[in-house]
């Protein structure tokens, strides 16, 4: 057993059939020695008398809040949450596997430039009694520091029968150097609690590997004389590190009609304008990804090109 | 120890494209002993991530970007005499900082060269013969070390006496690479810079 | 699959003009582009121009500007290469290339050779 | 129009050696580079491209590099059918060009 925080206790459990469970020791946090009773939850059952009290802890109904009174007064709360670990492996029923970039990748993160500062999100299909707590640090080991947000519903999307809700946090490397070498990577520690259950994910990483610059920006068009070729030319995000010659993108240009099936036309450069065919209903779209270290590329901007 | 923006020297255009060539060869090396190695930790999640010239040169400082000059994370316990408030400096001054620039990033390169010719020795024994380095690579290292036409002593090829640990070997390997191509980046974009200065 | 079969050796005469078609099949025949490459014997390859057969959009190389005509006809899925004014450097065998991108070539024709003499 | 230089004109490489095929355009292209093998008699076959994206169908044994000017095509380990002649092509701008090709020839 061990404190998540003031008054919340997590018990790890090992989760199999007829488990012994685990043996908790519950103090009241009070000066008082006799004529204390404890309860769980809301159920006014007496289930022991003493300024201790002794459970075994074998399943969810054990897990929950106790409650230490005296002559009808409150002393103290202490909650318990349970920590599942099945064959070895704790339980991840809270979040959902994203599968991206592989297996078993619950959080997944960005950023949209080496400032230090990274966006992480997760997946689940709980919709209410759900907290998130997020930690996050440079290494491990002599942990340099990271502050996150708070945790907030991002999005709801509604996926078959179910209804799929993100949540995201925000996180800023105290002090980033956007032209560091990275040799720690990032940790990020999410706890989540689902009513009585207690679940945390990892997710270490390098800022350099987690780029996704935003797509390019005033993206404008100009018919070249005499010719089916467009001139497209584009500027840098606002987000994107600067100086953009340090920091350099290369950029994917691309004429497509509505469906991914058509016939396209598509070429690379280093530069911010290029020169295409445009055909009629399509439109032609940019991406841009860093120029010397290949991580993901961006979204597309794109423009009609009528 | 930063880089103010400044006329480039006319020879800068060829550094570029051997930094370019460079970061190539190195990402191709890489690419190769991953695949080749794949049932080793050769990935980036798997290696220890050291810096073989740590505290021996200091590129990232020496070539920092004047625009970055501002940012107290980058000059964190680094030697800023040169910055005098952020104006611009004298270009006596300024070719100075750029020749400590070229010349950490030289350091830089035979650092790795004696590593890599080193750790080539110790593979081309290996009876498995299952990778060897890029002569390739170690070509283009060789060129952006002319192209950056500093002198300074030979740094010995290191021997050993006793047998090599190949299993080891082929691990520093791809911890070297791993740190040789993130150096590689940052040489790229530092000639980017002085290329578009 | 997607298959291109071409037309048959032709020896013309210097100053004639020639025709060259290119049957696609396996795929719809707008939803690639059509290209035309020569190669002179034991030369190099040459790009000489694409067409859009959705539309008819043409592209052509300069050096080919005025001197060749490419055209589809969409209901027998045959594009048609037509070169004026034959020289015996013309002298070449005649591709046709098709892709759904437009500036690479991923389906060949088997080619055809064209003779200039007189 | 862009000029793209092959080398060399000729390779004389024994089967299982590993070939290296160099490409050199006249400005920066980017990764816009595709190569072909071209056998006697037969039209050309698209084995890379842009730069290094495989092709199904096309054995592992051929792979891609480079950016800006200069590529190169890797063939691993060669085999009886690789000796043919290599052409790359750039897609930077039109015109379309193609090197002037690498015979690889049995040594």
């Known amino acids: 057993i061990w404190e998540l925080k003031k008054d919340v206790y997590v018990v790890e459990l090992d989760w199999y059939p007829d488990a012994p469970g685990e043996m908790v020791v519950l103090t009241c946090d009070t000066p008082e020695e006799d004529g204390i009773t404890w309860t769980l939850d809301q159920s006014s059952e007496v289930l022991g008398s003493g300024k201790t009290l002794t459970i075994q802890v074998k399943e969810f109904g054990d897990a929950g809040q106790y409650t230490c009174h005296k002559g009808g007064e409150v002393l103290s709360h202490s909650l318990l949450l349970l920590h599942k670990k099945e064959d070895g492996i704790w339980s991840t029923d809270i979040l959902k596997d994203q599968k991206e970039p592989k297996n078993k990748t619950f959080l997944r993160c960005e950023a949209k430039n080496y400032s230090g500062r990274f966006t992480c999100w997760w997946l689940t299909t709980i919709s209410t009694d759900l907290t998130f707590s997020v930690k996050s640090s440079r290494g491990s080991s002599d942990p340099q520091g990271v502050t996150c947000g708070a945790a907030t519903l991002s999005a709801e999307r509604v996926r078959g029968d179910n209804k799929e809700y993100e949540y995201s946090v925000e996180c800023q490397e105290d002090s980033a150097c956007p032209a560091a070498e990275e040799s720690l990577p990032i940790e990020v520690m999410v706890d989540a609690v689902h009513k009585l259950k207690y679940e945390n994910y990892t997710s270490s990483f390098f800022i350099r590997d987690i780029i996704k610059p935003d797509p390019p920006k005033n993206l404008q068009l100009k018919p070249l004389k005499n010719s089916r070729q467009v001139e497209v030319s584009w500027e840098y995000p606002d987000t994107w590190s600067t100086p953009h010659s340090y920091f350099s993108l290369t950029f994917c240009v691309q004429v497509q009609g509505k469906s991914k099936r058509e016939k396209k036309d598509r070429v690379f450069t280093d530069k911010t304008s290029a020169t295409v065919i445009c055909r009629k209903n399509a439109s032609i779209s940019v991406r841009a990804q860093d120029r010397y270290y290949s991580s993901s590329w961006s979204e597309w901007a794109s423009v009609p090109c009528s | 120890r930063n880089l103010p923006v400044a006329t480039p020297d006319p020879g800068m255009f060829p550094c570029l494209h051997h930094s370019q060539n460079l970061l190539r060869a190195v990402s191709n090396m890489l690419q190769k002993a991953r695949q080749t190695l794949e049932f080793y930790p050769c990935t980036s999640e798997e290696i220890d991530h050291e810096d073989i010239t740590k505290d021996k040169t200091s590129t990232v400082e020496a070539c920092l970007p004047l625009e970055l000059t501002k940012n107290e994370s980058c000059l964190n316990s680094r030697e800023t005499s040169f910055i005098t408030n952020g104006s611009c400096l004298a270009s006596r001054k300024t070719s100075f900082m750029m020749a400590l620039c070229l010349s950490s990033i030289y350091e830089d390169l035979k650092m790795y060269q004696v590593e890599f010719k080193t750790m080539n020795a110790k593979l081309l024994m290996d009876p498995k013969r299952q990778i060897f380095l890029d002569q390739n690579m170690l070509a283009v290292i060789d060129e952006l070390m002319q192209a950056l036409n500093f002198n300074s002593e030979t740094v010995p090829q290191k021997s050993s006496l006793e047998e090599p640990d190949f299993y080891k070997t082929k691990i520093k390997l791809c911890i070297l690479l791993h740190a040789f191509r993130i150096r590689a980046v940052t040489i790229d974009r530092v000639m980017s810079y002085l290329n578009a200065s | 699959q997607v298959q291109l079969v071409q037309s048959g050796a032709e020896v013309e005469k210097p100053g004639a003009s020639v025709k060259v078609s290119c049957k696609a099949s396996g795929y719809t025949f707008t939803d690639y582009y059509l290209h035309w490459v020569r190669q002179a014997p034991g030369q190099g390859l040459e790009w000489m121009g694409w067409i859009d057969p959705e539309n008819g959009d043409t592209e052509y190389a300069p050096k080919f500007q005025g001197g060749v005509t490419m055209t589809t006809d969409t209901s027998t899925s045959t594009a048609y290469m037509e070169l004026r004014s034959l020289r015996s450097d013309d002298t070449a065998v005649y591709y046709c290339?098709?892709?759904?991108?437009?500036?690479?070539?991923?389906?060949w024709g088997q080619g055809t050779m064209v003779t200039v003499s007189s | 129009e862009i000029v793209m230089t092959q080398s060399p004109a000729t390779l004389s490489v024994s089967p299982g050696e590993r070939a290296t095929l160099s490409c050199r355009a006249s400005q920066s292209i980017s990764i816009n580079l595709h190569w072909y093998q071209q056998k006697p008699g037969q039209a050309p076959r698209l084995l890379i491209y842009f730069a290094s994206q495989s092709i199904s169908g096309i054995p592992a044994r051929f792979s891609g590099s480079g950016s800006g000017t200069e590529f190169t095509l890797t063939i691993s380990s060669l085999q009886s059918e690789d000796f043919a002649v290599y052409y790359c092509q750039q897609s930077n701008s039109f015109p379309l060009t193609f090197g002037g090709g690498t015979k690889v020839e049995i040594k």
């Open positions: 290339a098709a892709n759904k991108e437009l500036r690479y070539f991923d389906v």
